[in-house]
């Protein structure tokens, strides 16, 4: 199976100044001993074998490399330098495997597991025998190093100095290039199918190629302005209606097959218009209003749809009244014409101002267009009047007026006077006669259900959770910002995301540091120390293991028996004492009379028989909650996550790089950062826009929701289009109605339901 | 050499049960998608489902969507087709196969196939 | 869900003929589209990948091309071995569909 990271270590030198085994032998010398001289030169082939197992405080050297384990060729004679790791050594090191060599001091452990951080290294130099199996004889040197490494490309440098050799090496841990995380178990590989459109952020997000969305990006972006309600798409940049539904955004409803005068709001309606009936739509209910059939007078009144019936005034018949009877007796002739029975009927003599058959028509003097500059003419008897536009005065509106003395600009740079009129400069983002009208910026710009507000000369898209960028066309994903601690594995859920804790945190963010040693799992009255998700048992000295469950031989070769104070009988047939080892390994026996003893410990002991570790942890030296593990005549310091340093005293800067968005100012907190966000923008990293759907996105009445991939406006009766903006009836065709009026159309004509703050017949 | 080797076809009764494996050797499991896809008696191919071992993503058709699960045991190099409630028409040789991807190229096949195994549900 | 129709749904021919199978997407699929050689009572066998790619193994024979809608498998001279089903495939959007397949003759 494929790794899941690499643990990789460079040696760049190895100092065998005396070119001599561990042993103090030589190298090369016959039996294996120190020559009086000393050793020769280049007398050890020299390699190097590495050992990786699971963190110990007290380094054994025995025991399998439970992590892993590598080994190097011969590098070289009883001292060597190579080339260090970092962009120099790189270099020289891609120079060699261009020549067809391997990098000889490179040492490359995989491992098929998360990344437990904490490590033991153990690091061997051999000298190479042809003719030996490696055996302790062989040993040149042995270092070992106990510490916390977290993935990262940068190498972190060690030196050892040995009893025979000194040893410069650098290690680092490394994720697959699929795997991330600091334990490298969150797994992403970008792809480009069915299974997914993606690409992988330095998080291991999966960051969607342009046109897919959703938690896999499987999901297609349809095309801006699509209703996802009647419409979708499988492929991006589409809109394909559902069955009943048509046009660009599928937001028109396909009416009933033939219906001729009406509309639908649902698919297959057929809903008439004013003074239209029947199943299509197609029967006039209003014959006499739309034909006028009857003449001389005649009343008509509807009948059936299509049907109508005249009514005629004394004198005439017919189906129409079209057939005169005796006509003048009925005195017709209106305003003091003169009635003259003619074959057809009757005829009247008209006296000055009137005309028409029963002189019922005042003569229009406004028929010759008297009133000049679109002035409107009122017919009077026997004359007429102009009532002007504004910008003209005078009898027949012949006369230009000066306009801007009104000051009718209101959002303009400046107010010019023209012959018939005048001229509003607007400033950017408004429009109209007198820069009234805010231009509407929004056009369906705002994806992913963005709520588009409209700005003065401009717009801002409302995003909804999970979404950011100027048109919300960003997947914002939660896990993105790597909030949760301690190597937790970051799930991004729909309203949120989830930590998945390893062993030895919770919380929800997994910051939370359970204490393993509450109960204690340590043995044999060991003390329990609590380390970020691990535990470490301090065992005393006859016990060992993790648990300090495993005893350990406290006299090996068996008891002994006291003669003096600080020796023992040899055994029988051997002359002498030997010494009895009570003071243990830390400490120098001293005979005292009478047979007693006392100890001289060694530095970092205390006790008669100097078994006590001094207890090097008593003053709490490890800073900001580091947990301190007593070691002898010294401390080791485990830093919780934030904190770095030998005595846990060094935050590391986490505004490098700046994780802020949208000109955010970051400030540095521990193993944390805080985004002071611009105005406009909220979210961890200031990638969020803040305002929610408003009262503007969608015209004439209609009630804006958020629908996935864009917003939705829900239309009232009588206007479609995506954001309400299209009128269904023709008296409503263009808009007549501004400043946010809502058209109410009725056959030929319509009227303005104005909003506050405006009146008039179009909303002016 | 790459091999798929599928097993547990056979016989059951319509609203029963079936688990299919996929045995997988000669590459690493965890690098590949493995799908299955079915063919009825006479007919054409149609897709079942898939996984990526490395994370555990899956995808079904709707047609078996809440009735089949697939699941893989990168320990054992396995991917499996647990069938429920199944039908007269989910009778058909099931195979998996394995489809490589890359960001490069937009689909890029299922390059290796099982032999199949025959499932056949009738009462 | 995206159709993948195959056209001819068979054809016979003659062992060194140039044999043409298109393939024709209900909506736009990129190049994701894969060919298949399917023998009675045998798995597929993978021919071509992102519509135009050989896979490794197959013979130079077979070529194909195509993006957006419309696709082609050719062979530019039949051989015997070559008598078989041929299937198109789609995998630019869930769920992957395959065309109904074209059978292939000897005439």
């Known amino acids: 199976a494929r790794p899941m990271g690499y643990f990789e270590l460079q040696l760049s030198a190895l100092r065998n100044v005396n070119g001599e085994l561990l042993s103090g032998a030589c190298c090369d010398g016959d039996g294996r001993t120190t020559r009086a001289g000393g050793c020769g030169h280049d007398e050890c082939d020299t390699y190097v074998r590495v050992c990786l197992k699971e963190y110990q405080a007290k380094v054994t050297p025995t025991g399998p490399c439970s992590y892993g384990h590598g080994a190097t060729p011969v590098l070289g004679g009883n001292s060597f330098y190579l080339p260090p790791a970092g962009a120099a050594g790189d270099r020289a090191r891609a120079r060699a495997r261009a020549g067809g060599d391997q990098d000889p001091g490179l040492v490359v452990i995989p491992f098929q597991f998360a990344w437990p951080r904490s490590f033991t290294l153990i690091v061997e130099a051999w000298d190479w025998d042809n003719d030996t199996t490696p055996n302790e004889e062989l040993l040149i040197e042995r270092v070992s190093h106990a510490g916390m490494i977290n993935p990262e490309d940068r190498w972190k440098s060690l030196h050892f100095s040995g009893h025979v050799a000194h040893l410069e090496l650098q290690i680092r841990v490394r994720c697959d290039e699929n795997y991330y995380s600091a334990t490298c178990n969150k797994f992403c590989r970008p792809r480009n199918d069915f299974f997914g459109h993606y690409t992988c952020d330095q998080y291991g997000n999966k960051a969607c190629m342009d046109g897919w969305m959703g938690k896999e990006c499987k999901e297609a972006v349809c095309k801006q302005g699509c209703n996802l309600l009647h419409g979708g798409c499988t492929v991006p940049g589409e809109c394909r209606c559902s069955y009943g539904w048509q046009g660009r955004f599928c937001d028109e409803c396909v009416p009933y097959p033939g219906c001729v005068h009406g509309s639908c709001v649902e698919p297959w309606q057929c809903n008439c218009e004013t003074n239209w009936g029947g199943l299509l739509c197609d029967k006039d209910l209003n014959y006499c209003g739309s034909h006028h059939p009857c003449t001389n007078g005649g009343t008509c009144i509807n009948a059936e749809p299509d049907q109508y019936r005249c009514t005629c005034p004394d004198g005439y018949s017919g189906r129409n009244c079209e057939k005169a009877e005796h006509a003048c007796t009925s005195n017709p002739c209106a305003n003091g014409g003169s009635c003259h029975e003619v074959p057809s009927g009757f005829e009247c003599h008209c006296p000055s101002g009137w005309s028409g058959p029963t002189c019922a028509l005042d003569i229009d003097e406004c028929a010759s267009n008297p009133c000049a500059a679109g002035g409107t003419c009122v017919d009077q008897v026997d004359g007429f009047e102009c009532i002007c536009p504004e910008q003209w005065v005078g009898a027949t509106c012949q006369l230009d007026a000066n306009e801007c003395e009104g000051k009718p600009c209101l959002n303009a740079f400046s107010c010019k006077n023209l012959i018939g009129g005048y001229y509003c400069d607007c400033i950017p983002g408004w429009k109209g006669i007198n820069c009234h009208i805010n231009v509407n910026d929004c056009r369906g710009q705002c994806q992913h259900g963005g709520t588009c507000k409209d700005l003065v000369n401009g717009y801002q898209c409302v995003c909804p959770r999970g979404f950011g960028g100027r048109h919300c066309e960003l997947e914002r994903d939660e896990c993105a910002s790597s909030p949760c601690h301690s190597g937790g594995l970051c799930e991004d859920l729909a309203d949120g995301f989830h930590c998945h804790c390893p062993q030895g945190f919770s919380g929800p963010l997994c910051e939370v540091d359970v204490d393993l040693c509450e109960p204690s799992p340590c043995r044999n009255g060991a003390r329990c120390y609590n380390l970020e998700g691990d535990y470490y048992c301090a065992c005393p000295d006859d016990f060992g293991g993790k648990n300090c469950s495993v005893p350990r031989e406290p006299c090996p070769g068996g008891a002994c028996r006291v003669i003096d104070g600080c020796g023992s009988d040899a055994g029988p047939g051997m002359p002498g004492t030997a010494a009895s080892g009570v003071c243990g390994p830390h400490g120098r026996c001293v005979s005292q009379p009478g047979g007693n003893f006392s100890c001289i410990c060694d530095s970092g002991f205390t006790g008669t028989y100097c078994h006590e570790n001094i207890d090097d942890c008593l003053g709490q030296p490890c800073r900001n909650g580091g947990t301190c593990i007593d070691e002898v005549d010294a401390f080791r310091c485990f830093c919780p996550s934030g904190w770095e340093g030998e005595l846990c005293d060094t935050n590391p800067n986490d505004c490098l790089p700046d994780p802020c968005h949208s000109r955010g100012r970051c400030y540095d907190l521990v193993n944390d950062f805080y985004c002071a966000c611009d105005d406009g923008w909220k979210g961890k990293t200031c990638h969020s826009r803040e305002f929610q759907c408003d009262a503007y996105t969608c015209s004439n009445g209609g009630t804006c929701y958020d629908s996935g991939d864009t917003f939705r406006c829900a239309c009232p009766p009588g206007w479609k289009g995506s954001t309400c903006a299209v009128a269904k009836n023709s008296s409503c065709l263009p808009n007549p109605c501004v400043n946010g009026g809502t058209c109410v159309g009725s056959g030929a004509s319509f009227s303005c339901i104005c909003r506050d703050g405006w009146e008039g017949r179009t909303c002016t | 050499e790459v091999q798929l080797v599928e097993s547990g076809g056979g016989l059951v009764q319509p609203g029963g049960s079936l688990r299919l494996s996929c045995a997988a050797s000669?590459?690493?499991?965890?690098?590949?998608?493995i799908h299955w896809v079915r063919q009825a008696p006479g007919k054409g191919l149609e897709w079942v489902g898939g996984?990526?071992?490395?994370?555990?993503?899956?995808d079904y058709a709707n047609s078996v969507k809440g009735r089949f699960t697939i699941s893989a045991d990168t320990s054992k190099n396995t991917a499996y087709l647990q069938m429920n409630s199944l039908r007269a028409e989910d009778t058909a040789v099931y195979y998996c196969?394995?489809?490589?991807?890359?960001?490069?190229?937009?689909?890029?096949?299922?390059?290796?196939w099982g032999q199949g195994t025959l499932v056949t549900v009738s009462s | 869900d995206i159709q993948m129709t195959q056209s001819p749904s068979s054809l016979s021919a003659s062992v060194g003929d140039r044999v043409t199978i298109t393939c024709r997407a209900s909506?736009?699929?990129?190049?994701?589209v894969a060919w298949y050689q399917q023998k009675p009572g045998k798995a597929p066998k993978l021919l071509i990948y992102?519509?135009?790619f050989l896979y490794s193994g197959v013979p130079s024979r077979f070529s194909g091309s195509g993006s957006g809608t419309d696709f082609t498998l050719t062979i530019s001279s039949l051989q015997p071995e070559d008598f078989a089903t041929y299937y198109c495939?789609?995998?630019?959007?869930?769920?992957?569909?395959f065309g109904q397949g074209t059978k292939v003759e000897i005439k």
């Open positions: 196969a394995r489809n490589d991807y890359d960001v490069r190229s937009v689909g890029s096949g299922m390059d290796y």
């Open positions: 909506q736009d699929v990129s190049t994701a």
């Open positions: 992102s519509a135009s």
């Open positions: 000669g590459f690493t499991f965890t690098s590949y998608d």
């Open positions: 996984i990526s071992p490395a994370d555990g993503d899956t």
């Open positions: 495939q789609q995998s630019y959007t869930t769920p992957p569909t």
